[in-house]
């Protein structure tokens, strides 16, 4: 389903506010129809999407979302100002950075504006719902004849993240995994010069600043080592170019950059 963002034009039904602030959420006259679950994720603490399955409604319904924080200074109910739509029906809400307070209890309420007492409310700990961007700028340094060091960057959240490095050779059937703490560097002490290695990394907002369960996407992979016959000839050219970059630009120290950056370098 295609999802678009739209800012409401102000012609919102204001009756919902009355019910929201004066009516208990349950009474015997309330419809027994369940509301879809709202799932929220905070992307790199830059914005948050709270979404629901709009197609679970028996008939197309523009459900409305309100939210607030349990906060001494300001616990006012806020209306969603940027709805997400699926097939012209509300299916989510996007909150911007200034509206995100990771360490206050976030409360989100979904409501049927045609039947305002049909509402469902839940509390969320946003620090457990952060998903960082994938690690970037993977680089490999040869520390010694047989030792490699992998480094990477994360946008903004460095000390809050833990990482998972996966690597394999072209002879391996599966990845080898290694957990890495917030220092975002990984050493492979014993490298076989006859093999071609592939590395990738993902990150998670855990455990220093939150307890998120969700990992970022995997980084673009980075490669090291011998060429093999099964590889794409274009990659051979890129690798040859990499070697030139590392020897000329880095004074002989070998350093590889990620495929994304290589393609960028190749085309420019």
């Amino acid at each position: 389903l295609n999802t678009t963002i739209l800012t409401p034009n102000g012609n919102e039904d204001t009756t919902a506010d009355f019910f929201l602030t004066t009516m208990p959420t349950d009474s015997l006259s309330v419809s027994t129809l369940p509301l879809p679950e709202v799932q929220c994720f905070v992307f790199n603490v830059e914005y948050m999407n709270c979404t629901w399955n709009s197609s679970s409604e028996p008939q197309p319904t523009n459900l409305t979302l309100h939210y607030w924080y349990k906060n001494s200074d300001n616990d006012k109910v806020q209306k969603c100002s940027h709805y997400l739509f699926s097939e012209e029906i509300t299916s989510g809400c996007q909150l911007q950075k200034k509206e995100i307070h990771l360490y206050q209890t976030f409360v989100v309420q979904l409501q049927d504006p045609r039947e305002p007492r049909r509402q469902a409310t839940q509390m969320l700990k946003l620090q457990n719902l952060v998903i960082p961007w994938a690690p970037e700028n993977l680089t490999l340094h040869k520390l010694s004849e047989s030792q490699l060091e992998l480094n990477w960057n994360n946008r903004f959240l460095n000390h809050c993240l833990e990482h998972l490095v996966q690597y394999r050779t072209d002879w391996d059937h599966s990845w080898t995994e290694q957990s890495v703490d917030y220092r975002h560097k990984f050493s492979l002490p014993s490298v076989d010069g006859q093999k071609r290695y592939t590395f990738r990394v993902r990150s998670r907002f855990n455990p220093l600043c939150g307890s998120a369960q969700h990992w970022s996407e995997w980084s673009h992979p980075i490669h090291w080592g011998s060429n093999t016959s099964k590889e794409n000839p274009f990659l051979f050219a890129l690798e040859a170019e990499q070697k030139l970059i590392s020897e000329e630009d880095l004074g002989g120290e070998q350093k590889l950059i990620s495929e994304e950056d290589l393609h960028h370098h190749h085309h420019h």
């Epitope: 004066t22 959420t25 015997l28 349990k70 906060n71 209890t105 409360v107 509402q119």
Partner: antibody, heavy 121, light 108 residues
Framework: QVQLVESGGGVVKPGGSLRLSCAAS????????IHWVRQAPGKGLEWVAL????????YYADSVKGRFTISRDNSKNTLSLQMNSLRAEDTAVYYC??????????????WGRGTMVTVSS | DIQMTQSPSSLSASVGDRVTITCRAS??????LNWYQQKPGKAPKLLIY???SLQSGVPSRFSGSGSGTDFTLTISSLQPEDFATYYC??????????FGQGTRLEIK
Amino acid sequence: QVQLVESGGGVVKPGGSLRLSCAASGFTFSNSGIHWVRQAPGKGLEWVALISYAGSNKYYADSVKGRFTISRDNSKNTLSLQMNSLRAEDTAVYYCAKEVWTGTYDSFDMWGRGTMVTVSS
Amino acid sequence: DIQMTQSPSSLSASVGDRVTITCRASQSISSYLNWYQQKPGKAPKLLIYAASSLQSGVPSRFSGSGSGTDFTLTISSLQPEDFATYYCQQSYSTPPITFGQGTRLEIK
């Protein structure tokens, strides 16, 4: 009739398991967050766990984390608490309680009668 | 976690008395404070929510006040059915939810 009814309590040895249930009726169960709260004999109230209305957000007291699992079946209007690795200090009456929101404020407006769990060798 | 401390732990009073129970939070909880009444062998019953709002069906002799860290539950004229244990509960930093240790109100 609006009510919550707990069941499944009993006597169990330390290290054992028990599964409590809470049957709801008379309100829109599927749109309500539900909690477990316990009370040791002669003691005060202790919050145990919360499950959100649709069931995917779950929170636990530190004292039960990793041992207890809260779940719900909205199609059957039932709540469960799976209790593993039970300890003597888990001995208590266990209540399920419905969360209600009035404006931005939440409280427990409905409680079951409780079910007694005794952990003893 | 936020700690809730009630005082007194127990008190004796007579029918018709005005009774005040206090509850103190270890940090500011705005008005996220509820009061419950529990009688022996029974489940708790909500009396006051949001520090001062009377739950539907609860007699008006019960009232709540306070904000921040200090809260009070007042029973203006004690009735025989009011002898019970009373608990405060914060819902500000939730979860976890925390209760006070309880105040047992006995007949003098």
